[in-house]
């Protein structure tokens, strides 16, 4: 029996990220006896739910059960049956549901009620569905990347976990871009956080962190596009909108009712003499960039410095992990390399946006046209947001690391959320045992 492995003493947790454009289910696993150690939790599965975000089910709530089935069944397969009953399931909804709640709290409640009813039918320990705040979304994203990068570990390491990891214990900032909101979170250098709404205090593994965070609702890539279209159609002379953020030759008909459906476009709403308009792409990065900048109000700042819309932003400090749509978009555009300068990114975006739509479709035949058509806007938006919105410069650009996964776990708020809810990030540094429990007898 010398080398006979004992049954794995592991635990599992499930988090569903109910985003504005889609829902993803994440399964996490960790050794039961090392719960309080830093960096022991890792992702074993991601299942992307087929279909839109849950906020789109407002008129068809009865379809939510079927919508969640495939990924919940996948979780049933991945997690051993003996562990099902003790595996917690959490669903966190983000900005798509925040926007729905702004429109109608009753409708948002109804969607969450049906989600809860559906998830309660599985053999797991369902802990409820809730709309997380923008502040939580930012904070948990920051916790996730720093946990995975080993920044909370007090042991000094001579090696680097990931290629871009600096070997000091300075935490990384977190930049998260979703469809409906974007979050910026970091520890400022000796700077007072002038706005209490943006200040978070954490004590993690025996160390205090004063963290700045803000979530910009309506400034996720999808809602920013709706905002831009609503702003630009105001000054269109007819029902043709010549749009520099789409490729030359691209055409798409938009219903005005769809444009004004979201609370994000309310400030641009006006009575138009048509029910539909046609976007006609002209593919000009510079003009697209200028149009996007009009979404950021930088004329007013009640603090020593602001991002935009009068929101306090301290001076940027240290390295940043940019994830979610920051990563997906830049990955598609092949711009995630550490070696690509901001000037090079801008050059590539100019070329990409100027490419004719027919050419783009041929080059990326496997990509859905709806997504493909929006990469010019999304890439330009990311540059505008990071440079003019958050005040990154050509020099500080090299401190932005576009991250998809760290150590096999997706960068995003879900891991931090689960670590918090399962009390797996202790306030104090755990006492290290002389010997860890061996898996072998």
């Amino acid at each position: 029996t010398q080398n006979k492995a004992l049954p794995e003493n592991v635990k599992y947790g499930i988090v569903l990220d109910a985003g504005s454009s889609h829902t993803s289910l994440y399964i996490y696993k960790w050794p039961a006896e090392k719960e309080n150690d830093t960096g022991v939790v890792h992702q074993v599965e991601e299942c992307r739910v087929k279909g839109p975000g849950i906020s789109k089910f407002v008129q068809k709530v009865n379809a939510i059960g079927i919508y969640l089935t495939a990924c919940m069944e996948r979780a049933r397969e991945v997690i051993p049956r003996s562990q099902h009953q003790e595996t917690p399931v959490y669903l966190g909804a983000t900005a798509g549901m925040r926007l729905l709640r702004m429109e109608s709290e009753e409708l948002a409640d109804r969607v969450l009620d049906v989600v809860e009813r559906s998830l309660s039918n599985y053999p797991f320990d369902f802990q409820g569905a809730r709309i997380i705040t923008g502040q939580e979304e930012g904070a948990y994203g920051w916790i996730t990347i720093n946990y995975l990068l080993g920044k909370f570990s007090q042991k000094t390491r001579w090696f680097s976990i990931v290629p871009y990891e600096t070997n000091n214990q300075e935490t990384f900032g977190a930049l998260d871009l979703g469809g409906a909101s974007t979050q910026v979170t970091f520890v400022p250098q000796n700077q007072t956080i002038e706005s209490p709404d943006n200040a978070l205090q954490f004590r993690l593994y025996g160390k205090d962190y004063n963290v700045y965070t803000h979530s910009f609702l309506c400034y996720g890539k999808d809602q920013a596009l709706w905002q831009k279209l609503a702003k630009d159609i105001q000054v269109a002379s007819n029902e043709i909108l010549r749009d520099p953020c789409f490729h030359p030759g691209y055409k798409k008909v938009v219903n005005v009712s769809d444009l004004y459906k979201t609370p994000c476009t309310k400030r641009f709403e006006m009575t138009l003499p048509f029910q539909q308009f046609e976007i006609q792409g002209i593919g000009n990065y510079q003009q697209c960039h200028q149009s996007i900048l009009e979404l950021f109000n930088t004329s007013y700042c009640p603090y020593s410095q602001c991002a935009f819309n009068g929101i306090f932003l301290p001076p940027l400090q240290g390295d940043f992990g940019a994830f979610s749509a920051f990563y997906f978009v830049m990955k598609f555009l092949n711009l995630t390399s550490e070696k690509v300068s901001q000037e090079k990114v801008t050059e590539m975006m100019k070329k990409f946006c100027a490419q004719p739509w027919e050419e783009i479709k041929t080059s990326y035949a496997g990509v859905k046209e709806k997504y493909l058509s929006e990469y010019c806007f999304s890439g330009t938006y990311i540059l505008s947001l990071l440079l003019q919105g958050y005040h990154f410069t050509a020099d500080s650009w090299e401190h932005i690391h576009f991250i998809g996964k760290i150590q096999g776990s997706d960068a995003g708020w879900t891991l931090g959320y689960m670590l918090n809810l399962t009390n797996m990030i202790p306030a104090e540094q755990p006492l290290s045992t002389p010997l860890s429990h061996s898996t072998y007898v």
Epitope: E105, L112, R130, I131
Partner: antibody, heavy 121, light 107 residues
Framework: QVQLVQSGAEVKKPGASVKVSCKAS????????MHWVRQAPGQGLEWMGR????????WYAQKFQGRVTMTRDTSTSTVYMELSSLRSEDTAVYYC??????????????WGQGTLVTVSS | EIVLTQSPGTLSLSPGERATLSCRAS???????LAWYQQKPGQAPRLLIY???NRHTGIPDRFSGSGSGTDFTLTISRLEPEDFAVYYC????????FGGGTKVEIK
Amino acid sequence: QVQLVQSGAEVKKPGASVKVSCKASGYTFKSYEMHWVRQAPGQGLEWMGRINPSVGSTWYAQKFQGRVTMTRDTSTSTVYMELSSLRSEDTAVYYCARGKREGGTEYLRKWGQGTLVTVSS
Amino acid sequence: EIVLTQSPGTLSLSPGERATLSCRASQSVASSYLAWYQQKPGQAPRLLIYGASNRHTGIPDRFSGSGSGTDFTLTISRLEPEDFAVYYCQQYHNAITFGGGTKVEIK
């Protein structure tokens, strides 16, 4: 569908305590706050406080602080309201009412049928 | 705490008529924090309007709410026999308070 079923009528002596229960069904119990509101005979509505069933935290109206205790039992999806040091003016119908989800607004969407508490020597 | 004053105390109207009920707050109330309830004898109150102007599920469109700041109104466009009841407004600002109620009775 959502149901809130309250315990039956009670007759109490002055100085005694009363504990009224409210059993919830048809939704995820921990997701919504529960409030208690009372109504004296022929009078208006008076808010007493609320409990968050998820964590058990409470918030009481100033008038009732020190005399009211709200608790919950998540295993039976039941909330309780105990009022001590009863006096005749506590004679009223006591209602539980389901409030908001976290982050929502404080209006009372669904009410129990009410429990009449009579305080008489 | 915010005091809500409802007027009139009693409103005597005939079926088919329009009813206008007023609720005045002692200090400004965010619109999203004002609601209206209907209560019939021997029954629990029922939510009609939330967020000052949003009709709760299943509430007929003859009921409408309006107002902002300190002055709010519940309007019943054409009274039906089942609408004769007591109506309460409610606000939330740290604590919940209710108005004293308006009784709508048959003339």
